[in-house]
Amino acid sequence: MNGRVDYLVTEEEINLTRGPSGLGFNIVGGTDQQYVSNDSGIYVSRIKENGAAALDGRLQEGDKILSVNGQDLKNLLHQDAVDLFRNAGYAVSLRVQHRLQVQNGPIGHRGEGDPSG
């Protein structure tokens, strides 16, 4: 019997300072570019080496970005989301959702809060 794959979803506020080459990541998603089935949310698809996001270290590929400077990213066209980031200013606050894959055994698996493996 195979183990079950579960996901641990957490949210985090990430404050980035725009670097010389910008924020340093790519996005996918939007109402006209659904990257995840039945979800028009905005996701991080690429973290650029030595960019602001990479140097900060918290934003990860696969993260869902929920808001930028308090502005919700729900129901946006892809290009509108891109423009929102580009016009977000020097100090940018991102509310992000991390989705961590947790491999659980078929029986008697430990809870996710148990640090012992």
């Epitope: 990541f25 790519n26 996005i27 650029k48 892809h78 891109v82 580009r86």
Partner: nanobody, 129 residues
Framework: QVQLVESGGGLVQAGGSLRLSCADA??????????MGWFRQAPGKEREFVAH????????YYADSVKGRFTISRDNAKNTMYLQMNSLKPEDTAVYYC?????????????????????WGQGTQVTVS
């Protein structure tokens, strides 16, 4: 995983035309999220930017040397990008590479920077005599 394969290169006389294709043999439905470009490299020279296209084809950008002669396009239903090359010149002789990055940069476009792209094809030779 992304697997870009170019085709359509060959030998053509000056003034002639060629159409290059770049297909992703592996992506499936994610192709439509790629930002893509064409680059070329002539013997003894550095890799040179040729053209760029955004995810849905609504935004294109060209090097000055090919503007008005080359046209970049894409068909997301076929997982393929194209480069229509007209009025070819001997100086267009090079190996042509397609490149892709997943998603759109949230920063100012730097289409011509190879570091903006994560995935590259193996190249197709274009020779203009």
């Amino acid at each position: 995983q992304v697997q870009l394969v170019e085709s359509g290169g060959g030998l053509v006389q000056a003034g002639g035309s060629l159409r290059l294709s770049c297909a992703d043999a592996a992506s499936g439905r994610t192709f439509s999220t790629y930002t893509m470009g064409w680059f070329r490299q002539a013997p003894g020279k550095e890799r040179e930017f040729v053209a760029h296209i955004n995810w849905d084809g609504s935004n294109t950008y060209y090097a000055d040397s090919v503007k008005g002669r080359f046209t970049i396009s894409r068909d997301n239903a076929k997982n393929t990008m194209y480069l229509q090359m007209n009025s070819l010149k001997p100086e267009d002789t090079a190996v042509y590479y397609c490149a892709a990055a997943i998603g759109s940069t949230v920063d100012s476009y730097r289409h011509s920077d190879p570091l903006e792209y994560d995935y590259w094809g193996q190249g197709t030779q274009v020779t203009v005599s």
